[in-house]
């Protein structure tokens, strides 16, 4: 049978080759008649066998961490017969461990965040090193952790690598710490290998600082011309905390005049002093207010740091501004009848200088040929007005300070031109009428209507009549419909185209104005040769052709 002991070969041997052990058959009497052979992965490259003796050698440096076990096969042949002396056998060569690997922190970089002011014993982070050596081979992979840097604020548990706080820390003094942890194998004994890692420990902020004003007194100025909502200046408090813990709210603590407000710019953490009501230098030229500042978020357990809010005094000086003239009214509406003579009085506007010096005022009208204004603000006409051309005038009146012509104010002035009855009614359109030669008496020739350019206070009412001469000898008559229309009717039977081809009828139209106005309007009536149906259409057609230069048969 085969004879061998268990085979071990140390890793990382520096020798060119290493005797591992001997394989032999118990039938081998040492006369060199047997030949030993090695087969399997590593045979001939990692391990060789002395064919005569069965001695096995490792011919290359081995690394247990790469491969810890080789399974090989052995054969032994009788040289004289060429036959196997023993059945082929499998055997194992184990690579024994040496402490050739230092502990390594595979999860680095390490970074941890812990709240400032955390009590002693607070867990920060656990660091873990790995050692590639054999954990079952002595202490080659048994690790001990120690702190190389980080005392007195931190400690590390030797066997677990758990880092804890050992002293309270204030982020406002130092916000991060570099801790260096060493891991040693061989449980720290001589010949141990070591590895280190750095842990960045950042302190997160807690709200242990209240905001405090940078200044105990702020001096601000505001122009009396500033509109409400104007930002007149900023005040600033500082808070040693950061982020949400440094967010602050500013507010007014004292402002008897209730003229100012403070809003908080949450981006810059500044307090913005805002004008709540307009100020007037001539009325009050300085103010004093008190502001306070508090954190936006305060945890109950941190209230002890936030007793008594920080306050500051703000002195606000009002700056005098040369203000433009001020009209008594924001706008004026005046009325004047049309047809009044040039130079007629329209109305009076009035503006004053609101400043203390009370500059005299000059007035002017922007782009107007119809009105004039004097230095007293009296508006007069420069022309007679016609309501039927323009019923309203929109004027822009400008007041200018005599002492400072750049100080100007303008207001609108509306002038309504009032109606007088200065227009008689007229035909609403040009009428051309036709009558057949064979027309009977009482036949309607034309319906007419009238218009009046005057404005009617209630409603226009027109009265229609024939002129006196037409009434006495007319072939036609008129009926007033009492609805501002009238009809023209024939007053006889039969007309003669050859004798009287055209009639001109004078129609009087009167309005209901005071005094009443009457106009004379002429209606032209053509006599036509009509067909049996009595239609004037052909007559109208013939008229059209003649007017266009055609002759009809």
């Amino acid at each position: 049978g085969w004879v061998w002991n268990q085979f071990f070969v140390p890793e990382e041997m520096n020798t060119t080759s290493h005797h591992v052990g001997r394989l032999r058959s118990d039938l081998d009497n040492g006369n060199n008649s047997f030949q030993y052979k090695l087969l399997g992965a590593g045979a001939g490259s990692t391990f060789i066998i002395d064919e005569r003796t069965g001695d096995i050698y490792a011919i290359e440096k081995l690394d247990r961490e790469e491969r810890s076990l080789y399974i090989l096969r052995a054969q032994v042949i009788d040289i004289t017969t060429g036959r196997a002396v023993e059945p082929e056998s499998e055997f194992v060569i184990k690579v024994s461990d040496i402490n050739d690997n230092e502990p390594k922190f595979l999860d680095e970089p390490y970074e941890a965040i812990v709240p400032e002011m955390s009590p002693e014993g607070t867990l920060v982070i656990q660091v873990t090193a790995s050692d590639a050596d054999d954990p079952s081979s002595g202490n080659n992979a048994r690790l001990l952790y120690s702190l190389l840097q980080g005392q007195p604020y931190f400690s590390v548990e030797p066997t677990t690598g758990v880092i804890r706080i050992s002293s309270k820390m204030d982020r406002e003094l130092q916000d991060e710490y570099w801790v260096i942890i060493q891991a040693k194998d061989m449980i720290g004994q001589p010949g141990a290998l070591s590895g280190t890692t750095s842990v960045l420990i950042k302190l997160s902020d807690v709200n242990d600082n209240k905001p405090i004003f940078k200044e105990s007194l702020y001096r601000l100025t505001v122009s009396e011309s500033a509109p409400t909502g104007t930002s007149i200046g900023t005040i600033m408090a500082y808070d040693n905390d950061i982020g949400e813990n440094a967010e602050m709210d500013y507010s007014i603590e004292e402002d008897d005049s209730q003229t100012f407000d403070i809003i908080t710019n949450h981006e810059t953490q500044e307090g913005i002093v805002i004008l709540k009501k307009k100020v007037n230098f001539e009325h009050q030229n300085h103010y004093g207010i008190r502001a306070k500042v508090k954190n936006h978020h305060v945890d109950k357990q941190l209230m002890k740091y936030h007793t008594e809010a920080s306050t500051t005094f703000i002195k606000i000086q009002v700056e005098d501004v040369d203000e433009p003239p001020l009209f008594l009214l924001p706008y004026y509406i005046f009325e004047i009848f049309e047809e009044t003579p040039q130079g007629s009085f329209v109305g009076v506007v009035s503006a004053t200088d609101p400043d203390n010096r009370k500059s005299p005022i000059r007035y002017s009208i922007t782009r107007s040929k119809v009105f004039n204004i004097d230095d007293n603000g009296t508006i007069t006409t420069t022309n007679s007005l016609d309501r039927e051309i323009s019923a309203w005038y929109n004027l822009s009146i400008t007041a200018t300070e005599k002492y400072n012509i750049e100080q100007i104010s303008s207001i609108p002035v509306y002038v309504q031109v009032l109606n007088i009855n200065d227009h008689a009614p007229e035909f609403s359109q040009y009428y051309e009428s036709y009558v057949c030669e064979n027309a009977g008496s009482g036949q309607v020739i034309q319906t007419i209507s009238a218009v009046d350019r005057d404005e009617s206070i209630e409603e226009h009412h027109f009265y229609f009549n024939l002129s006196v001469e037409d009434t006495n000898s007319s072939s036609f008559t008129i009926i007033d419909n009492q609805d501002n229309t009238a009809v023209i009717l024939t007053n006889r039977t039969g007309f003669n185209l050859q004798e009287e081809p055209i009639f001109y009828i004078s129609i009087l139209i009167a309005d209901n104005g005071i005094p009443s106005l009457t106009s004379t309007n002429t209606l032209t009536i053509h006599v036509c040769d009509c067909d049996d149906s009595g239609s004037t259409q052909t007559c109208q057609y013939q008229e059209l052709m003649l007017s266009m230069g055609f002759k009809t048969e």
């Epitope: 520096n14 001939g44 002395d50 005569r52 011919i59």
Partner: antibody, heavy 121, light 107 residues
Framework: EVQLLESGGGLVQPGGSLRLSCAAS????????MNWVRQAPGKGLEWVST????????YYADSVKGRFTISSDNSKSTLYLQMNSLRAADTAVYHC??????????????WGQGTTVTVSS | EIVMTQSPVTLSLSLGERATLSCRAS??????LAWFQQKPGQAPRLLIY???TRATGIPARVSGSGSGTEFTLTISSLQSEDFAVYYC?????????FGGGTKVEIK
């Protein structure tokens, strides 16, 4: 009978290249380590390089590392030495030598007669 | 690297005399030492390996001894064919290194 026959030597300029061969016979080539050893004129022996049987492992003297490459072709039972960036100090007779058995695996039990390499401008 | 130091550099002896050649290693190389003989114009020839094992065909008058750092090659009775240069070589560590050689000449 084990025999080793070197070839490929010659005169080469500094910076040049040469490839030496060593034809082996009389033994199972793939079962033995093979070596190159050189001897400068009038000097002692200097080991150059070794390759294990089958070519899995190669080793070099510091003086040639990065410039010389040892290799073998088991099918031809031939050992090679590719020499690049040659220097005057590389001038020598280059011998190939067969490794031994067992504990003398990386030994030199049979030597070839050598081939001469001259590096000169 | 292991430095091999041979002494003496030259050994002048007569035929039939005993030759004792020394080889020292700069650190222990166990028994992984070989001795070679080289004659002018010839390739080296293996004499001893494993510090004391004679190679095939080497006569019994040639013997080796020692281990660790101190080694000796002994030729008990010099023959004419023994006059040559002798090199020791360690094969325990990379790089393999040779001694500077000892020349055995006829007195």
């Amino acid at each position: 009978e084990v025999q080793l026959l070197e070839s490929g030597g010659g005169l080469v300029q500094p910076g040049g290249s040469l490839r030496l061969s060593c034809a082996a016979s009389g033994f199972t080539f793939s079962s033995y380590a093979m070596n190159w050893v050189r001897q400068a004129p009038g000097k002692g022996l200097e080991w150059v390089s070794t390759i294990s049987g089958g070519g899995a492992n190669t080793y070099y003297a510091d003086s040639v590392k990065g410039r010389f490459t040892i290799s073998s072709d088991n099918s031809k039972s031939t050992l090679y030495l590719q020499m690049n960036s040659l220097r005057a100090a590389d001038t020598a007779v280059y011998h190939c030598a067969k490794g031994g058995m067992g504990g003398y695996y990386y030994g030199m039990d049979v030597w070839g007669q050598g081939t001469t390499v001259t590096v000169s401008s | 690297e292991i430095v091999m130091t041979q002494s003496p550099v030259t050994l002048s002896l007569s035929l039939g005399e005993r030759a004792t050649l020394s080889c020292r290693a700069s650190q222990s190389i166990s028994s992984n030492l070989a001795w070679f003989q080289q004659k002018p114009g010839q390739a080296p020839r293996l004499l001893i390996y494993g510090a004391f094992t004679r190679a095939t065909g080497i006569p019994a008058r040639v013997s080796g001894s020692g281990s660790g750092t101190e080694f000796t090659l002994t030729i008990s009775s010099l023959q004419s064919e023994d006059f040559a240069v002798y090199y020791c070589q360690q094969y325990n560590y990379w790089p393999l290194t040779f001694g500077g050689g000892t020349k055995v000449e006829i007195k």
